[in-house]
Each structure stands twice: as C-alpha cells, then as structure tokens.
C-alpha cells in the first residue's frame, strides 16, 4: 500500500482468482482513543470499533472512502483505490491502446520545437467517475524539471455505438537547451483513476525523436511567362526552432492531378522555393522535416494549382 | 582550426549533412525501435554529448567556436573508434554493401578537417572491450548508431549556422 | 493556491433556471481545471460538471446533460453553471471546485469553495 495524496491510498493486488489479498491497517487521524466506529463509503454499516482497523482488500467491495466517526461526527477519511497485477502485468483497462508506432502505446507525444514544449494525448471510451493526473521529468534516477499544466479533454469522437474521449496535457521542461543533444529522456506519468480503479502508464522520449513541424506556411504560386511551369514558394512555420541557419528543415514537394490514382512525383529540397509543372485541377502540396533528424514529416500545406 | 582559426564552414557543412545522411541509412528507424528498454541513462554515459555548456547554441559560436569545435571533434574521434572496433568488425559481419564503411571514413574525414596534421587536441577514452556474444554486440551497434545520429544532427546544425553565418 | 466562493443559489420552482457564479481569488485560477458538484442532503457529493483551464470541451453529470451550462471567464477568474429546467432532484448544495487533474469524480478537487444551497419545489 502506498499514499497517492492525502487520504487517498493504492493498495497493489495480485488479481487471480482465490487471491489471498493484502492486509491493510487504517489509523483514525485524531487525539481521541475510546469510542470510535469505521464505516465504508454511504453504508451505515458499522464495519469495526477502535483507533484502528484492520481489514483484508480482496477484490472492488472491500475498496472506497473509510470513514471513522465519534458521536455521529466524521473524523477522518481514507479512500483506498486497487491496482490490479494479472499474471505480473499491471491492468491497462482505461486506456486504449493506439498502436501507433508500436503496439501497448497508451500516450502519445508530439513537439513542434525543440524548446522543451511538447504535447501528450490518450483515449479512452470511459469519461463517468474519471480522473486523469500528470507528472513528467527528464530523466528518472535524477530527475530534471518539466512542468505540466491540467489536463483538458480535447475532443469527442463517435466511434460506432461508441464514444471516445481525447484527452491531452502540455508540458513545458523547466530548464530546455535546444540546441543540445539530449542525454537523458523525458519521462511522461498519466495517473488514472476509474471508480475505485487505480492505473498509470508512462511513456519515455527525446524530445528529438517526437519533433514533428507545422506545416509549411505562405504557399504561393508564381506562373512563369511562356511555359507550363510555375515557381513555388513557401516558408516555415513560425513555430518551428529559430534561426533557422541553425534549426533547418527540408521539404517534400508533389503536385497531385485530381485522380488519386495519378502518380505522384515527390521531389526533396532544402530550399522554401522550386519550379514545377502544375497542371489545371491539380493541387501543390508541400511537407517539412527536420533536416538532421528523421523525426515525423509534418502534415502537408496544400494550395490549388489553377 | 586548433590556436582559433576558423574551419572551412562550407566543406564542414556538407560533409556533416552527408553524415546525418549515413547514419540514417545504416539504422534507419525500425518500427521506432525503442532500445531505451534496456535502463538506458548508464549505457550511453560513456559516449560524449554535445551538452549546453559546450557552446554549440548559436550565440556560443557567436561569442567563440572553439569550444564547440572542440567537443564535435572529441566526439568524432569516439565514434570513429568505436565503429573501427571489433563491435562493428566483429561477428555478425555487417552487409557487403553496409554504409558502416562510408560512416567510418566520414567521421574520420571531418575530425582530420577540424584538426589539420601536427595538432593534436586531447581525445577522450575509447570505450572498454565489446561483448562477447553476436546478439549483445549487434545491440550495442544499433544503440552506438542511434547516438551517432543524435550526435551528428547537432554537429550539422553547428556547421550550417557557421557557413551561413561565421564564413569570412 | 485558489479561493473560491460560490453565489447565486436559492428557493425556485420546478422548471426555472438559476445561475450559479464561483469567484476565484489567485493569479493561478487560469491555470485550474474548474468543476461544479452538489450534495444533496443524507447523500454523497457527487460530479455536475467540469471545464478545462483552457475553456475547451466541458462534460456533464448524465442527469443535467442538456439542462445546465458551464463556462468560465478567465479574465474575471470566475466559473459559472447556468442551470435550466430546474426539478427537484437538483436541490442540494452546489460546490465550486478546482484541480490541476481532469476529473468527472466528486472525489479528486483540490480546492472547495463553501457551497451555496439550491432548493428546487415542485
């Protein structure tokens, strides 16, 4: 058992069936000594008498807030959550698994920059009796600074007969140097909490391997005089790293005809500028990558041909 | 360069671009496979870093390159070495046409042009022996090549800056 | 830490509307997640509604989806629950309440204003 906040403790089980379950001793948080009672959540039912109580948590009907009263007065509360282990692995019931890079990825993270800003998103289908707290640092046996703001729920899908809930946190390292190479990883901790179910789930990065760009800004197409061809130009982003000397991106041009079906010439350049064949109904679109590192190319900027 | 003359910023440039290139296509991400698994904050301790105090930030380079040069040079030393060892040579034997060779030849292309013949700048401690099992050592290789391109991206970016903006 | 005090409670029949306000004191109420939840008496607090810092997607309690109304105005760092179609299953006392976590349970805020009580007849 191990304290989560105040008043608020986990009590780690081995969920198999027969399962002897763990002893938990309670002590009423008060002066008093004679005359004590302890109740469970709403139930009036008198559960034991005395400063403490012991009590073997087994299974969900023995978590919740356990109350110990004097005189009909309630003097102190001790909500004791479960978090189950099957087979040696801790449940992963809350969060659905996005498979995306890999499978049993439960958070995802993205940054624009490398200024030490980065964004974490999970799904669920469970939003009644729901509680989502984080914690993050860079590196674990010596932690380093990063501070996260609250977690939002940031979208809602119907998906089939169900719902599925976004949900996403921003965090910020305390002391970023963008232009180092990263030795330790950020760590990312998600706290969830379903009913009387305790689960949390990490995730481990470099900032560098989550970069993925806006895309491209300003698309403009310039026709040349007397030819089929057209200069194209863009411009990064204005929330990718700067100077950009330093912090470079390159770029994947296509132009794309109507028909998904035509081919595609993708071309790679590291200039904000090029000259291509932009036939009437086709579109040109332009992606960003840094130029060093193969993180995520970010999503295309697109402008009509015509 | 060593004594505070300025590298040649352009041809440092390139030759750092083709080694991000390199050393992309001698690991390439593999289904971002995660070799952080293995309690990684002591395995890459012994391996230089390029860290915020080395002046390798623009206004670093601004105020003095030397440090930094200095650090990407240690660096490339330890990596040359590194994929000189028996970890690289060593069983499994790498592909014919692996871009290991290149790397190596790269990495030592641009030590010897930030370090020109007769200076010698102090180089860090090569790293202890190589596992002896074929299955640790090919693991070790993606980590050393996974922190290569850590490295080198930093090191490209040092060179851009300075041929955009520190060239004569 | 955050202040709150809640406001705009009282006696009102069955299908009326009330508005609640929630006046936080703290230059952090920007950066709270802010909940409503009531307690109804000889019951257990329970989850009404909540509203991330940012004032993005609220959720609601199924018993008021469709009836009651978060918002916030982070600029006069006060939250408010518009409450319409009034039954008398909405009575109890209303909380304000603030948390750094998202949270649908009543169990998981962090700071609690002193209620203010909304009785609803038939």
């Known amino acids: 058992i191990w304290e989560l906040k105040k008043d608020v403790y986990v009590v780690e089980l081995d969920w198999y069936p027969d399962a002897p379950g763990e002893m938990v001793v309670l002590t009423c948080d008060t002066p008093e000594e004679d005359g004590i009672t302890w109740t469970l959540d709403q139930s009036g039912e008198v559960l034991g008498s005395g400063k403490t109580l012991t009590i073997q948590v087994k299974e969900f009907g023995d978590a919740g807030q356990y109350t110990c009263h004097k005189g009909g007065e309630a003097l102190s509360h001790s909500l004791l959550l479960l978090h189950k282990k099957e087979d040696g692995i801790w449940s992963t019931d809350v969060l659905k698994d996005q498979k995306e890079p890999k499978n049993k990825t439960f958070l995802r993270c993205e940054a624009k920059n490398y200024s030490g800003r980065f964004t974490c998103w999970w799904l669920t289908t469970i939003s009644t009796d729901l509680t989502f707290s984080v914690k993050s640092s860079r590196g674990s046996s010596n932690p380093q600074g990063v501070t996260c703001g609250a977690v939002t729920l940031s979208a809602e899908r119907v998906r089939g007969d169900n719902k599925e809930y976004e949900y996403s946190v921003e965090c910020q390292e305390d002391s970023a140097c963008p232009a180092a190479e990263e030795r330790l990883p950020i760590e990312v901790m998600v706290d969830a909490i379903h009913k009387l179910k305790y689960e949390n789930y990490t995730s481990s990065f470099f900032i560098r391997d989550i970069i993925k760009p806006d895309p491209p800004k300003n698309l403009q197409l310039k026709p040349l005089k007397n030819s089929r061809q057209v200069e194209v130009s863009w411009e990064y982003p204005d929330t990718w790293s700067t100077p950009h000397s330093y912090f470079s991106l390159t770029f994947c041009i296509q132009v794309q005809g109507k028909s998904k079906r035509e081919k595609k010439d993708r071309i790679f350049t590291d200039k904000t500028s090029a000259t291509v064949i932009c036939r009437k109904n086709a579109s040109f679109s332009v992606q960003a990558q840094d130029r060093y590192y193969s993180s995520s190319w970010s999503e295309w900027a697109s402008v009509p041909c015509s | 360069v060593p004594g505070g003359s300025s590298p040649a910023w352009a041809q440092c440039q390139q030759l750092s671009q083709k080694l991000c290139t390199l050393a992309w296509s001698a690991h390439p991400l593999v289904g971002h496979m995660d070799l952080r698994e293995e309690g990684d904050e002591e395995t890459t301790n012994d391996v230089p870093h390029i860290q915020c105090g080395d002046g390798c930030d623009p206004q670093g380079l601004r105020d003095n390159s030397q440090f930094c040069l200095q650090r990407i040079r240690q660096g490339l030393i330890f990596y040359e070495k590194l994929l000189g060892s028996d970890i690289f040579t060593g069983e499994p034997s790498l592909l014919p046409d692996s871009p290991v060779g290149q790397l190596h030849a790269s990495l030592l292309g641009l030590s010897q042009l930030l370090q020109p013949e007769g200076h010698h700048w102090e180089t860090q401690q090569i790293p202890s022996p190589s596992p002896s099992q074929p299955w640790q050592r090919l693991l070790l290789r993606f980590k050393i090549l996974r922190s290569l391109q850590a490295f080198v991206a930093v090191a490209a970016r040092v060179f851009a800056h300075g041929a955009a903006t520190l060239s004569p | 830490e955050v202040q709150l005090v809640e406001s705009g409670g009282g006696l009102v029949q069955a299908g009326a509307s009330l508005r609640l306000s929630c006046a936080a004191s703290?230059?952090?109420?920007?950066?709270?997640?802010m909940g409503w939840l009531r307690q109804a008496p000889g019951k257990e607090r329970e989850f009404v509604a909540t509203?991330?810092?940012?004032?993005?997607?609220?959720y609601y309690a199924d018993s008021v989806k469709g009836r009651f109304t978060i918002s916030r105005d982070n600029a006069k760092n006060t939250v408010y629950l518009q409450m319409n179609s009034l039954k008398p299953e909405d009575t109890a006392v209303y909380y304000c309440?603030?948390?750094?976590?998202?949270?649908?349970?009543?169990?998981?805020?962090?700071?609690w204003g002193q209620g203010t009580q909304v009785t609803v007849s038939s």
């Open positions: 309440a603030a948390s750094n976590s998202w949270s649908s349970s009543a169990r998981f805020y962090d700071y």
């Open positions: 703290g230059r952090t109420f920007r950066s709270y997640n």
């Open positions: 509203i991330s810092w940012n004032a993005g997607i609220p």
